[in-house]
């Protein structure tokens, strides 16, 4: 008889036998035979396998190294890896989140368009006409210039993208 060249889904071919793959969370101990099924064992503490597999070793959970600014966002299970994120004020340098960098601040003349998260940096935008930012900040948006008119005052010094307008009293009409 012809041995199989392909097996079913969730099986693998070895020694002309179609053996069951180990389910996620388990590793291979021994291949199947004509009389015995594949022997699998659960992954140990701090280990995982996230697919149907024939691996003889489980993978170690990712370590969220606090020295790199990392902390655990989601604890790993026997079927999933640990997910790391960054401490407050820091964000991941890559999708894998293997290290963190400090959130960037927006310089004077720029405001925060989008506040940083654990996985994305601060997004800054230049303050448009009518708005300013006089600080370096990771949180502050561009502020609108003060409206002198609403205070019954007049503009004494024009605003810039870095400074607010300076208001002053209106000149009194002389008799």
């Amino acid at each position: 008889p012809e041995p199989p060249t392909a097996c079913r889904e969730k099986q693998y071919l070895i020694n002309s036998q179609c053996c069951s793959l180990c389910q996620p969370g388990q590793k291979l101990v021994s291949d199947c035979t004509e009389f015995t099924e594949t022997e699998c064992l659960p992954c140990g503490e701090s280990e995982f396998l996230d697919t149907w597999n024939r691996e003889t070793h489980c993978h170690q959970h990712k370590y969220c190294d606090p020295n790199l600014g990392l902390r655990v966002q989601q604890k790993g299970t026997s079927e999933t890896d640990t997910i790391c994120t960054c401490e407050e004020g820091w964000h991941c340098t890559s999708e894998a989140c293997e290290s963190c960098v400090l959130h960037r601040s927006c310089s004077p003349g720029f405001g925060v368009k989008q506040i940083a998260t654990g996985v994305s940096d601060t997004i800054c935008e230049p303050c448009p006409v009518g708005f300013f930012s006089n600080v370096s900040s990771a949180f502050e948006k561009c502020h609108p210039w003060t409206s002198c008119e609403t205070k019954d005052l007049v503009v004494q010094q024009a605003g810039t993208n870095k400074t607010d307008v300076v208001c002053g009293p209106q000149d009194r009409l002389r008799a």
Epitope: P3, P4, Q11, C19, S20, E34, T36, E37
Partner: antibody, heavy 122, light 107 residues
Framework: EVQLQQSGPDLVKPGASVKISCKTS????????MHWVKQSHGKSLEWIGG????????SYNQKFKDKATMTVDKSSSTGYMELRSLTSEDSAVYYC???????????????WGQGTLVTVSS | DIQMTQTTSSLSASLGDRVTITCSAS??????LNWYQQKPDGTVKLLIY???SLHSGVPSRFSGSGSGTDYSLTISNLEPEDIATYYC?????????FGGGTKLEIK
């Protein structure tokens, strides 16, 4: 059509032996392991063992190691099981069944014979 | 040996009922479980293999599920021809072992 045709009922005396046959048809005999299962009256099923027709390899339930011997005749696509030193405990229905040798159907015993009643009585 | 326990030895149900038969193993068996039907005349048929795969020719009203040590066979719409005894069987370890059986009767 897959068929496993077993020999007829047997009445045997204590201490004697009996050989049950299981003639197969409708499939390639060497592509399936032949297994044997015991069912005592009103009881559940017990796996006795299995034999690989291609190479004669066997696996026995330890409980039946000294009781049963499985053989095959590839030329007639027939399996045999001999039971020896019979006692009243061996009175039961014995089934032959099969499992695809390469495991594509996992370890399913997918077709069964009709059973052979063996009665041990003096 | 792995012990297979079918706690309900007999079960009475009405035609059209949804019936669930359970089976538990004395240790984890990795879904390595089959279900068989034995008719009153002694005929044995495979219904489900590897916990949930339906054997060819078996009506779709039969389904299997479970994991670890606990497994079940469900008949979704009981028919008269389903009167039989149902057995679970593990193949995780040698020797293969069967449950004690659950005899299904019609009310």
């Amino acid at each position: 059509e897959v068929q496993l045709q077993q020999s007829g009922p047997d009445l045997v005396k204590p201490g004697a032996s009996v050989k049950i046959s299981c003639k197969t048809s409708g499939y390639t005999f060497t592509e399936y392991i032949m297994h044997w299962v015991k069912q005592s009256h009103g009881k559940s099923l017990e796996w006795i063992g299995g034999i690989i027709p291609n190479n004669g390899g066997t696996s026995y339930n330890q409980k039946f190691k000294d009781k049963a011997t499985m053989t095959v005749d590839k030329s007639s696509s027939t399996g045999y099981m001999e039971l020896r030193s019979l006692t009243s405990e061996d009175s039961a229905v014995y089934y032959c069944t099969r499992r695809e040798v390469y495991g594509r159907n996992y370890y399913a015993l997918d077709y069964w014979g009709q059973g052979t009643l063996v009665t041990v009585s003096s | 040996d792995i012990q297979m326990t079918q706690t309900t030895s007999s079960l009475s149900a009405s035609l059209g009922d949804r019936v669930t038969i359970t089976c538990s193993a004395s240790q984890g068996i990795n879904n390595y479980l089959n279900w068989y039907q034995q008719k009153p005349d002694g005929t044995v048929k495979l219904l489900i293999y590897y916990t949930s795969s339906l054997h060819s020719g078996v009506p779709s009203r039969f389904s299997g599920s479970g994991s670890g040590t606990d497994y079940s066979l469900t008949i979704s719409n009981l028919e008269p021809e389903d009167i039989a005894t149902y057995y679970c069987q593990q193949y995780s370890n040698l020797p293969y072992t069967f449950g004690g059986g659950t005899k299904l009767e019609i009310k």
